[in-house]
């Protein structure tokens, strides 16, 4: 090995990665909110919809104070990976009725992917354990009907909205601990 030489700084550091993750999550939350509103306008929901294959909400307002960095990032990444797969599935399985929302769903999927990459980079830079994202517990088969895919879209967007909402709060809280 040669004499010690310095390395130029790379593009970001863990704290900048966390800032970037917060911005991406906020922007994704706004997109999801807007898309969910569009869904409600076009296809009014008759009550709450859920899908067994969606992750259960990780956090409540009461548990925010006890959050630990590894737990939040791991859970957030696993949950977002699940939502990413569900959006992918929705785009493939959607009937003609949902095709009008294809550009928005495509953009949502791309932003989810970006956020997932940013979270993974942050976890790598901090050297936190990275659990392999589980496949959906329930295999995602084609929806039973056109109405089935609309109900699934309501459930996916609603769940993603709640997940991103706690994610923003959780990540902001973690910023103070890094």
């Amino acid at each position: 090995p040669g004499p010690p030489a310095g390395s130029p700084r790379v593009s970001s550091d863990p704290r900048a990665d966390l800032d970037s993750a917060v911005l991406l999550t906020r922007s994704l939350l706004a997109d999801t909110r807007q898309l969910a509103a569009q869904m409600r306008d076009k296809f009014p929901a008759d009550g709450d919809h859920n899908l067994d294959s969606l992750p259960t909400l990780a956090m409540s307002a009461g548990t925010l104070g006890s959050l630990q960095l590894p737990g939040v990032l791991t859970r957030l990444r696993v949950d977002l990976m699940s939502y990413f797969r569900h959006v992918q599935w929705l785009r493939r399985a959607a009937g003609p009725s949902l095709k009008t929302l294809e550009p928005e769903l495509g953009a949502l999927q791309a932003r989810l992917e970006r956020l997932l990459r940013r979270l993974q980079l942050l976890m790598s830079r901090l050297a936190l354990p990275q659990a392999a994202p589980d496949q959906p517990a329930v295999p995602l088969g084609p929806p039973a009907s056109a109405w089935g895919s609309i109900r699934a879209a309501h459930a996916i967007l609603g769940g993603l909205h709640l997940t991103l909402d706690w994610a923003v709060r959780g990540l902001l809280l973690l910023k103070t601990r890094l």
């Epitope: 550091d13 990459r117 993974q120 790598s124």
Partner: antibody, heavy 114, light 111 residues
Framework: EVQLLESGGGLVQPGGSLRLSCAAS????????MHWVRQAPGKGLEWVAV????????YYADSVKGRFTISRDNSKNTLYLQMNSLRAEDTAVYYC???????WGQGTLVTVSS | QSVLTQPPSASGTPGQRVTISCSGS?????????VHWYQQLPGTAPKLLIY???ERPSGVPDRFSGSKSGTSASLAISGLRSEDEADYYC???????????FGGGTKLTVL
């Protein structure tokens, strides 16, 4: 400018011990996970161990588990690797690396031979 | 034997475009883990060339680009130059190790 400077390498007999150090500067050491990666002469890179930014997580390659211990002192911006029960196959240049790894030191040579 | 598989050697003439592949499995690259690429010039330490599949650290020329698809990734070098002659390594996180795994390395020769 980021600097990682390894020290502590040298010649040691099989079964012996060595402690490597890595002094870091030019970045927020306490915000980065830190790795040791080694490279045997003429061979490729082999990951050895990692410690999380705050020291709470430590993981090792199977080849060194139970013999090597990684640690860090964030107040001194220093990473350590305690190597015990050294074997001939541990002969390599040992690099200290930060993050992904994003930054690498220049390495320190460890030779295990009788 | 490396967990990530790379061709041991690659070559090209100045100005050419060269691609180096990195093949993983469903437990690392295929599980959504990002791929990073390193360049090691003769007698020096490795240097980060591409991170998160396709991002370039500041200071790395845009002749270097990365991509990932399924369980494999690739590094492309366009406008090959003599100073690109080096060993190139891919790496990805492996959850079974809780650490990164490296490819065996590809020796690039500029003819």
């Amino acid at each position: 400018e980021v600097q990682l400077l390894e020290s502590g390498g040298g010649l040691v007999q099989p079964g012996g011990s060595l402690r490597l150090s890595c002094a870091a500067s030019g970045f927020t050491f306490s915000s980065y996970g830190m790795h040791w990666v080694r490279q045997a002469p003429g061979k490729g890179l082999e990951w050895v161990a990692v410690i999380s930014y705050d020291g709470s997580y430590k993981y090792y390659a199977d080849s060194v588990k139970g013999r090597f211990t990684i640690s860090r002192d964030n107040s001194k911006n220093t990473l350590y690797l305690q190597m015990n029960s050294l074997r001939a196959e541990d002969t390599a240049v040992y690099y200290c690396a930060a993050g992904v790894p994003d930054y690498w030191g220049q390495g320190t040579l460890v030779t295990v031979s009788s | 034997q490396s967990v990530l598989t790379q061709p041991p050697s690659a070559s090209g003439t100045p100005g050419q475009r060269v691609t180096i592949s990195c093949s993983g499995s469903s437990s690392n690259i295929g599980s959504g883990y990002d791929v990073h690429w390193y360049q090691q010039l003769p007698g020096t330490a490795p240097k980060l060339l591409i991170y998160s599949n396709e991002e370039r650290p500041s200071g790395v020329p845009d002749r270097f680009s990365g991509s990932k698809s399924g369980t494999s990734a690739s590094l492309a070098i366009s406008g090959l130059r003599s100073e690109d002659e080096a060993d190139y390594y891919c790496a990805a996180w492996d959850p079974s190790l809780s650490g990164p795994v490296f490819g065996g390395g590809t020796k690039l020769t500029v003819l």
